[in-house]
C-alpha cells in the first residue's frame, strides 16, 4: 500500500501539466494576505534636535491581498528537467481587514534623506545634499500616507538632486505590474527529491550580494518542498524579500483542518551573530554598525537595494541584540506574533499554512554637513514597518486534500 501511495505522490507532486501540484503551483489556491503595521514616530523633533530615543507606536493592520496572480512565462525544459517562470507582483487593499485607509498619515523617517546621506558620503556632496534638503523643506522625518510609504511618492528633495536619480521613493516601489524572477526550478520528473528546488534565479546560481556560502540560492521558494519531509530535516529556502537563503527547523506537530502537518520555524540561530553561529560570518558585511560582527538580528541588505541602507529584521527586533533595539522605545517582541513559521504536509511537501513575518528598517547616521542629521549622536536602525504575510489552505481544498492524500494513507 505504501509503495502505491509513494508512487502516486511522486507522480502528483511533479511540476508538469496535469498534476495536482502543478495546478496549485501555477496559481495558488490559497488566499494570501499581507498585513502591515507602520511604526508611527511620536517624537520626531526630540530625536532630530537631541538625539533622543525614537518613540514608536505601531499602527495596523493594513491588509492587502497578494499572490493572486498566476505565474507567467511558464516554460518547461525537458533537457534539464526544469521549469522557469516569473512570479508577478500585485497587491489589492482590503479595507474590511484594515484599521484604516490607504490615506492614513504616518510620521516616519525620511527615506530619501537617510538613503542619500548614506550613499553619498563625500563631505562636499553632503553639503550640496544639505542645501537641497533645506530648499525642499525636507527633514529627518516626514509625514506620508500609507499608499505613499508602501507604493511610492515623488520626493521633493530628490527632485532637486542634479544627478540622474530615481525621484520616486517607496518601500515597495515599484510593485504592481512588476514580477519577481526569472526563477528556474527543478520539475522533479527525473528526481522527485529535487522538485521545486531552485536551480537558478535571474539566470544565476548565486546572488552576488554576499561572500562565500551566504551567496548561494538554496532550496525552494518555501511554497512547497520535496515530498516525504522528515522532522529531522533542515528545510532550506530562498526569499527574494530578504535577498538571501535561510532555513527552518521542525518545531511541533500541528493539526490543520484535520490534516496532520509539521510546523517548521525559523530558529533564532539563523539570526545569530558569527560569534554564536560561525556560519553567519558572511552575512556580516561591515564592522561599524555591526560592532565588529557582534550585533545580531538585523541583516544589512544594502547591496541588494542599490546601496540604500535597508536592514531586515524580525518584527519588533525579535531575536536581535539589545544594542539594536536600545535607541527605540515602544517595541514589544514576542515569538508567537513575530516569528516566521511554515506548516508543511510531510507526504506531499506542500506548505498548507504559513506566516512570513519581517520588519523593514533604515539606517540613519549623524552627518556634520547635513543640518537635519547634525545633532544625532549615534546611529539608528529605524523601524519603518513590519509585515505578516499569511496563507491557509481553504476548507474545500482541505477536504479534497484529506480525502485524496491523508485519508488514503490513514
Amino acid at each position: 500500500g505504501d509503495l502505491l501511495i509513494q508512487k502516486t505522490i511522486k507522480k502528483q507532486v511533479v511540476l508538469e501539466e496535469g498534476t495536482i501540484a502543478f495546478k496549485n503551483w501555477v496559481k495558488t489556491g490559497t488566499e494570501v494576505y499581507r498585513q502591515f503595521w507602520i511604526f508611527d514616530v511620536q517624537n520626531p523633533q526630540e530625536v532630530m534636535m537631541n538625539s533622543s530615543n525614537i518613540q514608536v507606536k505601531q499602527r495596523g493592520p493594513y491588509t492587502y491581498r497578494v499572490r493572486f496572480l498566476a505565474k507567467e512565462n511558464v516554460t518547461q525544459d525537458a533537457e534539464d528537467n526544469t521549469v522557469s517562470f516569473l512570479q508577478p507582483n500585485g497587491a489589492i487593499f482590503e479595507p474590511s481587514l484594515s484599521v484604516g485607509t490607504e490615506a492614513d498619515n504616518f510620521t516616519v523617517l525620511n527615506l530619501a534623506v537617510a538613503a542619500a546621506s548614506h550613499i553619498y558620503q563625500n563631505q562636499f556632496v553632503q553639503m550640496i545634499l544639505n542645501s537641497l534638503i533645506n530648499k525642499s523643506k525636507s527633514s529627518m522625518f516626514q509625514v506620508r500616507t500609507l499608499r505613499e510609504l508602501l507604493w511610492g511618492y515623488r520626493d521633493p528633495f530628490l527632485s532637486l538632486v542634479p544627478y540622474p536619480v530615481t525621484t520616486t521613493v517607496g518601500l515597495f516601489y515599484p510593485y504592481n505590474n512588476t514580477a519577481d524572477g526569472v526563477y528556474k526550478v527543478f520539475n522533479g520528473k527525473d528526481n522527485i527529491s529535487k522538485v521545486a528546488i531552485i536551480d537558478t534565479y535571474k539566470g544565476k546560481r548565486n546572488l552576488s550580494y554576499w561572500e562565500s556560502h551566504c551567496d548561494m540560492i538554496n532550496g525552494t521558494d518555501a511554497a512547497s518542498f520535496p515530498p516525504f519531509v522528515e522532522k529531522s530535516q533542515v528545510l532550506q529556502f530562498f526569499s527574494s524579500d530578504i535577498c538571501r537563503s535561510i532555513y527552518a527547523v521542525f518545531e511541533s506537530d500541528v493539526n490543520l483542518k484535520g490534516i496532520p502537518v509539521y510546523r517548521f520555524v525559523l530558529p533564532s540561530k539563523a539570526f545569530a551573530s558569527p560569534v554564536e553561529n560561525p556560519d553567519n560570518y558572511c552575512f556580516c558585511t561591515e564592522k561599524i554598525i555591526s560592532k565588529n560582527c557582534t550585533s545580531y538580528g538585523v541583516l544589512d541588505i544594502s547591496k541588494c537595494k542599490e546601496g540604500r541602507p535597508v536592514y531586515i529584521s524580525l518584527p519588533h527586533f525579535l531575536y536581535a541584540s539589545p544594542d539594536v533595539s536600545e535607541p527605540i522605545d515602544g517595541l514589544n517582541p514576542n515569538e508567537e506574533e513575530h516569528r516566521t513559521y511554515l506548516d508543511i504536509e510531510p507526504i506531499t511537501g506542500f506548505t498548507l499554512q504559513f506566516a512570513k513575518r519581517l520588519q523593514v528598517n533604515l539606517l540613519v547616521k549623524p552627518s556634520e554637513k547635513i543640518q537635519v542629521l547634525k545633532n544625532l549622536k549615534r546611529n539608528y536602525i529605524v523601524p519603518i514597518l513590519w509585515l505578516n504575510e499569511t496563507g491557509t489552505i481553504g476548507d474545500e481544498k482541505a477536504n479534497m486534500f484529506r480525502s485524496q492524500v491523508t485519508g488514503k494513507i490513514n
Epitope: 563631505q123 562636499f124 550640496i128 542645501s131 533645506n134 530648499k135 543640518q371 547634525k374
Partner: antibody
C-alpha cells in the same frame, strides 16, 4: 536668485587685522554652508574654509588656521572673515561662495592690499 | 593635500576650434571634480560638477570627462566669449584644492 554682496576694497598695514563681509540675499542664509576662497594676483585659487550659518560650525584649511576666522550674523544674513597679523602674502582677492549645487554662486570678491 | 596639475598655463586657439584643457590629480579623486571659468576682473563661474555634469545654463559645447586622476574639459566650437582662464577643483577630500589654471588665448 542668490546674490552675494562683498565689502569694498581694503588697504591695511602689515600686522593689522581686517574683517571682510559677505551679505547674502535671495535664499535662506542658514540653509547653505558658506565657503571662502583666496586668489592672489595672477595666481590660482586657494580654499580657506567653510562655515555652517545655522550653528556657526567651521572647518578650515590647515594652512589658514590662526590666520582666518569665519563667523556669521544670522539676523543680517551676513558672513564674515577676519584675517589677522596681515603680511603682504595676504594681499589677494577674497571670495565668499555658498554651497548650493556646488560652488555655483560667487560674490564679486573683496580686494585686500597689505602695504605699509 | 591633493595637488591638481594643469600642465598648460596657456593655450592658443581660434574661434570655431575644439580645445581640451587637462587636469591631473596627485591621487585618485573618483569623479569629484569641478571646472570653473574666470574672465579678467570677474568671479569664477561654475561650469561642470562631478567631472562630467554641466551646470544649468552652461552651453553644451562645454564637456567634462575623466575619473580617477585624469580629467579633461573640452570646448568644441570655441567662441570669443570662451577666452578666459579655466580652473579644475577637487572635492574628494579636504582641504578642497584647485588647479593653477589654464588661460585660453586667441592665436
Amino acid at each position: 536668485q542668490v546674490q552675494l554682496q562683498q565689502s569694498g576694497t581694503e588697504l591695511v598695514k602689515p600686522g593689522a587685522s581686517v574683517k571682510l563681509s559677505c551679505k547674502a540675499s535671495g535664499y535662506t542664509f542658514t540653509s547653505y554652508w558658506m565657503h571662502w576662497v583666496k586668489q592672489r594676483p595672477g595666481q590660482g585659487l586657494e580654499w580657506i574654509g567653510e562655515i555652517d550659518p545655522s550653528d556657526s560650525h567651521t572647518n578650515y584649511n590647515q594652512k589658514f588656521k590662526g590666520k582666518a576666522t569665519l563667523t556669521v550674523d544670522k539676523s543680517s544674513s551676513t558672513a564674515y572673515m577676519q584675517l589677522s597679523s596681515l603680511t603682504s602674502e595676504d594681499s589677494a582677492v577674497y571670495y565668499c561662495a555658498p554651497i548650493y549645487y556646488g560652488l555655483d554662486n560667487w560674490g564679486q570678491g573683496t580686494t585686500l592690499t597689505v602695504s605699509s | 593635500d591633493i595637488v591638481l596639475t594643469q600642465s598648460q598655463k596657456f593655450m592658443s586657439t581660434s574661434v570655431g576650434d575644439r580645445v581640451s584643457v587637462t587636469c591631473k590629480a596627485s591621487q585618485n579623486v573618483g569623479t569629484n571634480v569641478a571646472w570653473y571659468q574666470q574672465k579678467p576682473g570677474q568671479s569664477p563661474k561654475a561650469l561642470i560638477y562631478s567631472a562630467s555634469y554641466r551646470y544649468s545654463g552652461v552651453p553644451d559645447r562645454f564637456t567634462g570627462s575623466g575619473s580617477g586622476t585624469d580629467f579633461t574639459l573640452t570646448i568644441s566650437n570655441v567662441q570669443s566669449e570662451d577666452l578666459a582662464e579655466y580652473f579644475c577643483q577637487q572635492y574628494n577630500s579636504y582641504p578642497l584644492t584647485f588647479g593653477a589654471g589654464t588661460k585660453l588665448e586667441l592665436k
